[in-house]
């Protein structure tokens, strides 16, 4: 058993049929010695009396908020949560496996630049009785500070018969140098509680590996005289690290017909303009990627040919 | 990345072309190592990230873009940054800080070159003959060093009398390639910045 927050304790249980469970001794936080009674979850049923209460925690029915009272007055609370371990593996019932980029990916994180700011998100099908807390650091043995905000519900989607909820959090490394070469990964730890179930999830990454630039901005077409060709021009996204001559991007320009089956013409360039043939009803899209370290491509920025 | 690559103009900053070749060569070598040594811990997640140049050179700090010198987090180890001009810019006068930046890059290349050559000698003794260093990568390191045009003491190649542990050597190769790729990215950024200055 360990303390998660003030008066909140996590009981780690091996979860299998007829498991013996854990013996837990609760102590009422009071100088009083006599006339103390214990209840669970605002029930009127008295579980025991005295300054301590010993319970055998085997299942969720044994968890909950234990309260000690004296003469109708509440003295203190202790909330017991359960953390299940099945076949030596901690349960991951609360969050959904996103399976990208690999199986058992519960947390996904992205950064728009090298400033040390990043966003992580996760998915669940649970709509209520849910709470999260996020902690992060650079390295684990001698951790350096990363500050995370509160996790918020960022999207709701319908997936077949199920509703899916996306939560996200923003974090910022306390003292980040965009030009630094990372040798210690960022660690992200998410605590999740659903009803009386506790779970934790972790992710470890280098900012350089989770970079995904915003799409190029101000995408414009300039028709070339007496030609089907157009000059496409764009700019670096505002959120990208500066100076751009040091943090350079490379670009992919794509001409896509109306039908998805039509052949796509693609050109790669380090410049912020390109000349392409604009077909009728086609659209021109441009996306960006770090020129020197191949992390993710940005989403496409698009304009119609006409 | 297998993308069309534009060849630089002859008048361009000469080191930029070499640094681009370097990054391409080390990335290819790392990819090859990860494929060949698939049953060894050779991915970014599995290896310990070590920097053989740590406390010996200060490339990141010495080559910091002017714009980042206002960022205190970038200056925690030294309050210096480069100013434009450099020895690779043909006949232009080199500033003191530029020289420091480029000589730091040169020292990095020299240290990695020695490590790679020593390692290759060991790998050539492996009866499995599983992996060797790409001669192209070693040549590209050499070319960039020549373009940087610094005179420096030659470091003798390390020789070891003991029987090499090939498993450890291959893991060290992965560690070295990961670190060298990160440094090659920094070098490329620096050269690109200088070229634009």
């Amino acid at each position: 058993i360990w303390e998660l927050k003030k008066d909140v304790y996590v009981v780690e249980l091996d979860w299998y049929p007829d498991a013996p469970g854990e013996m837990v001794v609760l102590t009422c936080d009071t100088p009083e010695e006599d006339g103390i009674t214990w209840t669970l979850d605002q029930s009127s049923e008295v579980l025991g009396s005295g300054k301590t209460l010993t319970i055998q925690v085997k299942e969720f029915g044994d968890a909950g908020q234990y309260t000690c009272h004296k003469g109708g007055e509440v003295l203190s609370h202790s909330l017991l949560l359960l953390h299940k371990k099945e076949d030596g593996i901690w349960s991951t019932d609360i969050l959904k496996d996103q399976k990208e980029p690999k199986n058992k990916t519960f947390l996904r994180c992205e950064a728009k630049n090298y400033s040390g700011r990043f966003t992580c998100w996760w998915l669940t099908t649970i709509s209520t009785d849910l709470t999260f807390s996020v902690k992060s650091s650079r390295g684990s043995s001698d951790p350096q500070g990363v500050t995370c905000g509160a996790a918020t519900l960022s999207a709701e989607r319908v997936r077949g018969d199920n509703k899916e909820y996306e939560y996200s959090v923003e974090c910022q490394e306390d003292s980040a140098c965009p030009a630094a070469e990372e040798s210690l990964p960022i660690e992200v730890m998410v605590d999740a509680v659903h009803k009386l179930k506790y779970e934790n999830y972790t992710s470890s990454f280098f900012i350089r590996d989770i970079i995904k630039p915003d799409p190029p901005k101000n995408l414009q077409l300039k028709p070339l005289k007496n030609s089907r060709q157009v000059e496409v021009s764009w700019e670096y996204p505002d959120t990208w690290s500066t100076p751009h001559s040091y943090f350079s991007l490379t670009f992919c320009v794509q001409v896509q017909g109306k039908s998805k089956r039509e052949k796509k013409d693609r050109v790669f360039t380090d410049k912020t303009s390109a000349t392409v043939i604009c077909r009728k009803n086609a659209s021109i899209s441009v996306r960006a990627q770090d020129r020197y370290y191949s992390s993710s491509w940005s989403e496409w920025a698009s304009v119609p040919c006409s | 990345r297998n993308l069309p690559v534009a060849t630089p103009d002859p008048g361009m900053f000469p080191c930029l072309h070499h640094s681009q070749n370097l990054l391409r060569a080390v990335s290819n070598m790392l990819q090859k190592a990860r494929q060949t040594l698939e049953f060894y811990p050779c991915t970014s997640e599995e290896i310990d990230h070590e920097d053989i140049t740590k406390d010996k050179t200060s490339t990141v700090e010495a080559c910091l873009p002017l714009e980042l010198t206002k960022n205190e987090s970038c200056l925690n180890s030294r309050e210096t940054s480069f100013i434009t001009n450099g020895s690779c810019l043909a006949s232009r006068k080199t500033s003191f800080m530029m020289a420091l930046c480029l000589s730091s890059i040169y020292e990095d290349l020299k240290m990695y070159q020695v490590e790679f050559k020593t390692m290759n000698a060991k790998l050539l003794m492996d009866p499995k003959r599983q992996i060797f260093l790409d001669q192209n990568m070693l040549a590209v390191i050499d070319e960039l060093m020549q373009a940087l045009n610094f005179n420096s003491e030659t470091v003798p190649q390390k020789s070891s009398l003991e029987e090499p542990d090939f498993y450890k050597t291959k893991i060290k190769l992965c560690i070295l390639l990961h670190a060298f790729r990160i440094r090659a990215v920094t070098i490329d950024r620096v050269m690109s910045y200088l070229n634009a200055s």
Partner: nanobody, 120 residues
């Protein structure tokens, strides 16, 4: 941060029925238990019924068989169905919620109350 709003109270004849509702809004986090309490003039507040996170109800002796507590998780609403009401049930009925938010810790919230009067 968590608001509880009760409704459904009123004047009812002995033997009659009422259904109280309590809607929870705000960042409720993980709710560990919800309960209905009542307070009659000049008397101490007393627990009427409670329901835990697993949906298990509990009743004070005097209301067993007459009152039913239930919770609609999706709507974050607590109900109290009161049948066979007697004048002794006259009181202000208050909704109570206990929960956990990992950013702030354990919390307890009370509603303003809804008046139930049983009289002929």
């Amino acid at each position: 941060q968590v608001q509880l709003v009760e409704s459904g109270g009123g004047l009812v004849q002995p033997g009659g029925s009422l259904r109280l509702s309590c809607v929870a809004s705000g960042s409720t986090g993980s709710i560990t238990s919800m309960a209905w309490y009542r307070q009659a003039p000049g008397k101490q507040r007393e627990l009427v019924a409670s329901i835990n996170s697993g949906g298990r109800p509990n009743y004070q002796e005097s209301v067993k068989g007459r009152f039913t507590i239930s919770r609609d998780n999706a709507e974050n609403t607590l109900y109290l169905q009161m049948n066979s009401l007697s004048p002794e049930d006259t009181a202000v009925y208050l909704c109570n919620l206990r929960g956990l938010r990992l950013d702030t810790g354990l919390y307890e919230s009370w509603g303003q109350g809804t008046q139930v009067t049983v009289s002929s």
